[in-house]
C-alpha cells in the first residue's frame, strides 16, 4: 500500500520586538519531536506593525489595541487554529521603553499594561510583555546568530550549510544596532572580563561559554542623531545649524522641545534663545565623522582598555555578525558585500554624503524622505562606532559580516529570546537517537 503522510507534528511561537522606532512580530516554527536539536527552529513570518514604537503611545494608550491588530490577525491566519491555544506569545520591549521608564516608570507601566491587555484578547498563550535589559538584548542576539549558523551543534561537517560558515565551532560575535541602543557581544580570547556587569556565563549543548556583552543606551542611530544635534546646536551662532551629516541643499526645521524630550540629550541641554532651528545640510563626510566622534568620551578608562565612556571592551576576537540597523543601512548604501574593504566603504560614504539632496531624492524616489535624509548620518555613524567606538581596523573590517537573515530567519534577539523562554537550548548535549520518528507509515 502507498505510504501516507501523517499530519505535521509542529509547534509555533510568536515574539514581538517592541523597538524604539517600530514593532515587529515574528512567528517561529519547529518540529515538536526535535525541540532540543540545534538549528531546527525557523522563522515562517515577519509582520512589521504600521506606526512608531510603543513608547510613542504614551499620550494615546487607547490606540495600542488597533495598532497591534493587523499583525496579530496575521498570526491567527498563519498558525493553524488547532495550535492557537498552545502557541506562546512574548513581547520584549527594548531601549525605547528603557528610556521611557527612565523618564516615568508609571507611564512605561501604563503602556505595557495596555499592550498586555490587548495581546491577552487573542486566542494564543500570552506570556506577558516586559522591558528586556540591554544585557539580555545582546545575549539573545548572540544566541540567535550562533544557533542559526550551527555553531552550537557538536557535529563537524565537511560542507557548509550557511554563508559565513567557517567549518569550526568558533562562535561569531554579535553587533546589533537599534534606534536607541547598540549592543556588542562576543567570546573574548582567554581574556578576563574585567567588569562583572559585562560578563555572561552560558552552558549550551554541553559547552561552556564566557561571553562579553555591553549595551550602549542612547547610542542607537536615532538617539545618536539627537545627541549630535543637541551637542552641535550648543555652539551654533543662531537658529541655523549647518550640518555636515545631511546632504547639501537639505533643510529641516527642528523643535527645541523635541530635541530635549529624550533623556539622551540631557547632558547637552541648555537654554536657547529660540524655540526652533533649521538644519541646513552641507554634506561633508569627514566633518560629520568628526562631529560624531565627540559623542564618544575616550579620555577616561578605568580598565586595561575601553570602548568609550569608560566601558570595558576586551580585544576583538573572531568573526562578527552585524545585524538590524547595521545591516539595513549598509544594505541601502550597497555596502554589505564581503569584498568591500573599509577604505572603499569610507570612500563611498564620502561620495554619498556629498551628493545634493535634490539628486538623492530623484535617485531614490520610492524611499520616504525622513529615512532617506538620514542615511548619510547613519552610514557615517556606523563607521565611527565600529572603528573608533569598538576599535575595528581596516584589517579586522573583513571579519564583520553584515547579515540580514540566516537561513530565512532574521538576525536579532527575538529568536534567542524565544529559544530561552521555551527551554529549547539545553545546557547539556542531547543524546542522539539512532532513528528519528518517521513521518510516514
Amino acid at each position: 500500500t502507498q505510504n501516507k503522510a501523517l499530519p505535521e507534528n509542529v509547534k509555533y511561537g510568536i515574539v514581538l520586538d517592541a523597538g524604539s522606532s517600530h514593532t515587529s512580530l515574528y512567528i517561529y516554527k519547529w518540529p515538536a519531536e526535535k525541540e532540543n536539536d540545534t538549528g531546527v527552529v525557523h522563522q515562517v513570518e515577519e509582520c512589521r506593525v504600521k506606526g512608531p514604537g510603543i513608547s510613542k503611545f504614551v499620550q494615546k494608550v487607547n490606540e495600542i489595541g488597533i495598532y497591534l491588530t493587523d499583525c496579530m490577525e496575521r498570526a491567527r491566519e498563519v498558525i493553524p487554529r488547532s495550535q492557537h491555544q498552545e502557541t506562546p506569545v512574548y513581547l520584549g520591549a527594548t531601549a525605547g521603553m528603557r528610556l521611557l521608564r527612565m523618564e516615568s516608570e508609571e507611564l512605561a507601566d501604563r503602556v505595557l499594561d495596555v499592550v498586555e491587555r490587548s495581546l491577552s484578547n487573542y486566542p494564543f498563550d500570552f506570556q506577558g510583555a516586559r522591558i528586556i535589559t540591554g544585557q539580555e538584548e545582546g545575549a539573545y542576539g548572540w544566541i540567535t546568530i550562533n544557533y542559526l549558523l550551527g555553531k552550537f551543534s557538536q557535529k563537524t561537517r565537511w560542507f557548509s550549510i550557511v554563508p559565513y560558515e567557517t567549518n569550526n565551532q568558533e562562535t561569531f560575535g554579535a553587533l546589533d544596532l537599534g534606534g536607541a541602543s547598540t549592543q556588542v557581544t562576543f567570546v573574548p580570547q582567554n581574556q578576563t572580563i574585567e567588569s562583572p556587569d559585562n560578563a555572561l556565563q552560558f552552558r549550551l549543548y554541553g559547552k561552556d561559554y564566557n561571553v562579553y556583552t555591553h549595551s550602549f543606551l542612547c547610542y542607537g542611530k536615532d538617539q545618536a542623531l539627537w545627541q549630535k544635534l543637541a551637542k552641535d546646536i550648543q555652539v551654533a551662532s543662531n537658529e541655523i545649524l549647518r550640518d555636515p551629516c545631511f546632504h547639501p541643499g537639505y533643510k529641516k526645521v527642528v523643535n527645541v522641545s523635541d530635541l530635549y524630550k529624550t533623556p539622551c540629550t540631557k547632558r547637552f541641554e541648555m537654554t536657547l534663545p529660540f524655540q526652533q532651528f533649521e538644519i541646513q545640510g552641507i554634506g561633508n563626510y569627514q566633518q560629520c565623522h568628526q562631529s560624531i566622534l565627540e559623542l564618544f568620551n575616550t579620555s577616561y578608562c578605568p580598565y586595561s582598555q575601553c570602548a568609550f565612556n569608560g566601558i570595558f571592551l576586551p580585544p576583538l576576537q573572531g568573526d562578527f555578525g552585524a545585524f538590524s540597523a547595521f545591516y539595513f543601512v549598509m544594505k541601502f548604501l550597497n555596502l554589505t558585500s564581503e569584498k568591500v574593504s573599509q577604505e572603499k566603504v569610507t570612500e563611498m560614504m564620502k561620495k554619498f554624503c556629498a551628493q545634493p539632496w535634490e539628486e538623492i531624492k530623484t535617485s531614490y524616489a520610492g524611499v520616504k524622505e525622513k529615512y532617506l535624509s538620514e542615511y548619510c548620518f547613519s552610514g557615517t555613524y556606523i563607521l565611527s562606532l565600529l572603528l573608533q567606538g569598538y576599535h575595528f581596523t581596516a584589517d579586522s573590517w573583513e571579519h564583520i559580516h553584515f547579515i540580514g537573515k540566516i537561513q530565512g530567519s532574521d538576525a536579532g534577539w527575538t529568536l534567542g529570546y524565544m529559544l530561552n523562554l521555551t527551554n529549547m537550548i539545553p545546557a547539556e548535549q542531547p543524546l542522539s537517537t539512532p532513528l528519528s520518528h518517521s513521518t510516514y507509515v
Epitope: R101, E105, D109, E116, R117, F126, A129, R130, I131
Partner: antibody, heavy 121, light 107 residues
C-alpha cells in the same frame, strides 16, 4: 481599572493563624509583584514582604520570617498572606499593594482596601 | 536596615499655607528608591511621589518632592482642605521601610 479587593475582617485567638486574600483585576496578574503592609491602630506603616506572582518567589521582612507565608493562585489572580502564631501585637489593618514590574522600582502604586485582623483572647 | 526619620511629627498649618515635610535616612538612599504617600483616616495610603521627585499619575502639581542622599523633602505649595492627612516617606534598599509619618493638621 486596576483593583485589589481584600477579604473581610477577622477575629482570631492568640496562637492561631490568619489567611488574608487579595484578588487582583484590571491588569495582567503575573506582571507585577504584590506586597503586604500592615498598620497597627494609630501607628505607622510596616512592610511585611512581597511575592512575585509569575514564579511564586517570595521575600519576607526579617521581623516576619518564619511566621509569614505568601502564596498566589494564578487561575484566580489572587494572592494570600498567612500569618501564624498570632499575638495581640498583630492586631492591625493588613493591606496588599501592587509593586513593580520586573526591572522597575519598589513603589506601591495601587492598594487594597485593607483587612482588619483582631487578635484577642 | 535603613531607618527613615520624619519631622516634624505634627505640622499645624492653615489652608493656603506652604507645608514642608522632611525625611532623613540613616544611610544614603538612591533617589530612584524614595517615595511619598498620603493617608487619610480609614483609607489606604495613596502614592504621591516616586523617584524622590516624580509626581504619580493624577497628583496635583502643588505636591513636589526633592532631595538626594540622606535628606528628602515633600513640599505642598498651597494647602487645600483635602491635603490635611498623614504623610509617609518610603525607601527601598533590599527591604522596604517607611518613615514614622508626619501629620499635617488644620491650625
Amino acid at each position: 481599572q486596576v483593583q485589589l479587593v481584600q477579604s473581610g475582617a477577622e477575629v482570631k485567638k492568640p496562637g492561631a493563624s490568619v489567611k488574608v486574600s487579595c484578588k487582583a483585576s484590571g491588569y495582567i496578574f503575573k506582571s507585577y509583584e504584590m506586597h503586604w503592609v500592615r498598620q497597627a491602630p494609630g501607628q505607622g506603616l510596616e512592610w511585611m514582604g512581597r511575592i512575585n506572582p509569575s514564579v511564586g518567589s517570595t521575600w519576607y521582612a526579617q521581623k516576619f520570617q518564619g511566621r509569614v507565608t505568601m502564596t498566589r493562585d494564578t487561575s484566580t489572580s489572587t494572592v494570600y498572606m498567612e500569618l501564624s502564631s498570632l499575638r495581640s501585637e498583630d492586631t492591625a489593618v493588613y493591606y496588599c499593594a501592587r509593586g513593580k514590574r520586573e526591572g522597575g522600582t519598589e513603589y506601591l502604586r495601587v492598594w487594597g482596601q485593607g483587612t482588619l485582623v483582631t487578635v484577642s483572647s | 536596615e535603613i531607618v527613615l526619620t520624619q519631622s516634624p511629627g505634627t505640622l499645624s498649618l492653615s489652608p493656603g499655607e506652604r507645608a514642608t515635610l522632611s525625611c532623613r535616612a540613616s544611610q544614603s538612599v538612591s533617589s530612584s528608591y524614595l517615595a511619598w504617600y498620603q493617608q487619610k483616616p480609614g483609607q489606604a495610603p495613596r502614592l504621591l511621589i516616586y523617584y524622590a521627585s516624580s509626581r504619580a499619575y493624577g497628583i496635583p502639581d502643588r505636591f513636589s518632592g526633592s532631595g538626594s542622599g540622606t535628606d528628602f523633602t515633600l513640599t505642598i505649595s498651597r494647602l487645600e482642605p483635602e491635603d490635611f492627612a498623614v504623610y509617609y516617606c518610603q525607601q527601598y534598599h533590599n527591604a522596604i521601610t517607611f518613615g514614622g509619618g508626619t501629620k499635617v493638621e488644620i491650625k
